[in-house]
């Protein structure tokens, strides 16, 4: 990545890390107002299977493993992008390294949930506080889960799907922060490890991600007041360990692995017509990327 | 019933390549990581590449690493390790394993096939 | 990497005979062990899981478990069939690693 300053520009879609024969350092951003991308700073260590969030305008990049031809290891990293820099620092690093992490974002608050750790796959969940740069352990997740999709909705953070280690998930559990506690909640339609998750208009969407036979390419979505997990149009590709977003009311997918190839194509949902649309390509195939969109 | 079959040895020079193949059935290589174990004569088992089915991730011994490349093609449910620059240190009994439910544990092999990389 | 000692590397015994083989790893690897038979010719069958689970199908005279770093498998009588090659692999950490294996030989 070029180490010029970044263009001022308005929200953007980010891109960091993911995997392509190996764990990759790119970090790369769209801008779904002209179609371009942008070449930014790398990351200073590439890792794969890594969440991104953003936090009061600067951009995390969280966990993942460095998975390259020198060895395999998991990562207990936390870095900061600032986009008016265009430079990555470090941050204090988690308690234990979390590959295939998920992440969510409550009152400036950084939440890492799950992940894997060599054999281990955690329940563990640690919050992170940015202005103390200090991680504290909160309440564990009721079910280990690794390739777990995570979004926040009403101050509530919502793990969905993954692994187990044993078996690939379709339950969903909910923390309540002023309780320090989690509650099972309806379990999706379909079982799904590696998919995308995130909020849009009230609902919890989970997009793609493998059953333990197949990667899926359907979209369901989860009502909070109904308490119920309906279909949506499925997406054009299938796909797991695939990156996801919402910028201006549509929800964006980003690569992913669908059993043959690493995907380079970038879909966009509408949710007022129901459909998907391929939007861009990223500058090349990848899959378990970290997604963000910069606050305006 | 669940049965790997390897395939693709044979003799090679020093420097020369090589592709194994790796025919399952009973159960479908998409739903599991598969692993490629070597054993070379009279020797040990060493672990030698795998690959994810759920992220396409692939993972290497660092003495076969930028050599030797795994892959899967569900559709023919088999899975491969294609094998560049091979040394005499290569030369080994090469099996693909089945990773069962639960880590890296390998709950099925197939019979092997035999490499041998000598001039 | 770590390593797994095994030990003894050989062994002699008769049929009935109670056969302990030992595997040391040089780190922790909490209980993400596993034991195999191997017989010359043949590829290796998995016996036990996650240091003393028994798989599927395998005769409950072998056993196996852990004590810190020290796994042993167990064969409480031996039997004609498992006169063969015994490894231990973790799979804690990347990559997984085998131990140099225990060749049980008729007394």
């Known amino acids: 990545g070029s180490m010029g300053h970044a263009p001022k520009v308005g929200r953007l879609i980010y891109t960091a890390g993911g995997y392509f024969r190996q764990s990759l350092s790119y970090l790369e951003a769209y801008n779904p107002s002209d179609g371009t991308w942008l070449d930014l700073a790398d990351l200073q260590v590439p890792r794969s299977g890594l969440a991104g969030c953003v936090v009061g305008g600067l951009l995390y990049a969280v966990g993942g493993r460095n998975n390259s031809p020198d060895g395999n290891t998991d990562s207990s990293a936390l870095d900061c992008y600032n986009p008016m820099t265009n430079q990555w620092s470090p941050c204090a690093p988690m308690s234990v390294p979390r590959n295939r992490i998920g992440v969510g974002v409550i009152d400036g608050h950084i939440y890492a949930v799950g992940g894997s750790h060599g054999c281990i796959h955690h329940n563990s969940v640690e919050r992170y506080e940015p202005e103390r740069d200090e991680w504290h352990l909160v309440a564990p997740m009721l079910t280990r889960r690794i390739g777990v999709g995570v979004a926040v909705l009403n101050r509530l953070l919502y793990a969905v799907g993954g692994f187990d280690g044993t078996n690939r998930l379709n339950s969903a559990e909910c923390y309540y922060p002023e309780r320090n506690e989690w509650r099972m909640i309806t379990a999706m339609n379909t079982i799904r490890s590696g998919a995308g998750v995130c909020v849009l208009h009230n609902c919890i969407y989970a997009a793609g991600g493998y059953d333990g036979q197949d990667q899926l390419n359907s979209v369901e979505r989860y009502d909070v007041e109904t308490e119920t997990w309906t279909f949506v149009a499925p997406m054009k590709h299938r796909r797991s360990a695939l990156g996801i977003t919402v910028h201006q009311g549509r929800i964006y997918v980003l690569g992913g692995y669908d059993g043959h190839t690493f995907l380079d194509s970038v879909e966009c949902y509408d949710p007022d017509t129901d459909t998907w649309s391929e939007v861009t390509r990223m500058t090349s195939g990848r899959s378990g990327v970290g997604v963000a969109v910069t606050m305006e | 019933e669940v049965q790997l079959v390897e395939s693709g040895g044979g003799l090679v020079q020093p420097g020369g390549s090589l592709r194994l193949s790796c025919a399952a059935s009973?159960?479908?290589?998409?739903?599991?990581?598969i692993h490629w174990v070597r054993q070379a004569p009279g020797k040990g088992l060493e672990w030698v590449a795998s690959i994810d089915p759920e992220t396409g991730e692939t993972l290497y011994a660092k003495s076969v690493a930028g050599r030797f490349t795994i892959s899967a093609d569900t559709s023919k449910n088999t899975a491969y390790l294609q094998m560049n620059s091979l040394r005499a240190e290569d030369t080994a009994v090469y099996y693909c394993?089945?990773?069962?439910?639960?880590?890296?544990?390998?709950?099925?092999w197939g019979q092997g096939t035999l490499v041998t990389v000598s001039s | 990497d770590i390593q797994m000692t095994q030990s003894p590397s050989s062994l002699s015994a008769s049929v009935g005979d109670r056969v302990t083989i030992t595997c040391r790893a040089s780190?922790?690897?909490?209980?993400?062990v596993a034991w195999y038979q191997q017989k010359p010719g043949k590829a290796p069958k998995l016996l036990i899981y996650s240091a003393s689970s028994l798989y599927s199908g395998v005769p409950s005279r072998f056993s196996g478990s852990r004590s810190g770093t020290d796994f042993t498998l167990t064969i409480s009588s031996l039997q004609p069939e498992d006169f063969a090659t015994y490894y231990c692999?973790?799979?804690?950490?990347?990559?997984?690693?085998f131990g140099q294996g225990t060749k049980v030989e008729i007394k």
């Open positions: 692999q973790q799979s804690y950490s990347f990559p997984s690693t």
């Open positions: 394993a089945r990773e069962g439910k639960w880590w890296a544990y390998f709950d099925a």
């Open positions: 009973g159960f479908a290589i998409s739903a599991s990581s």
């Open positions: 780190q922790s690897v909490s209980s993400a």
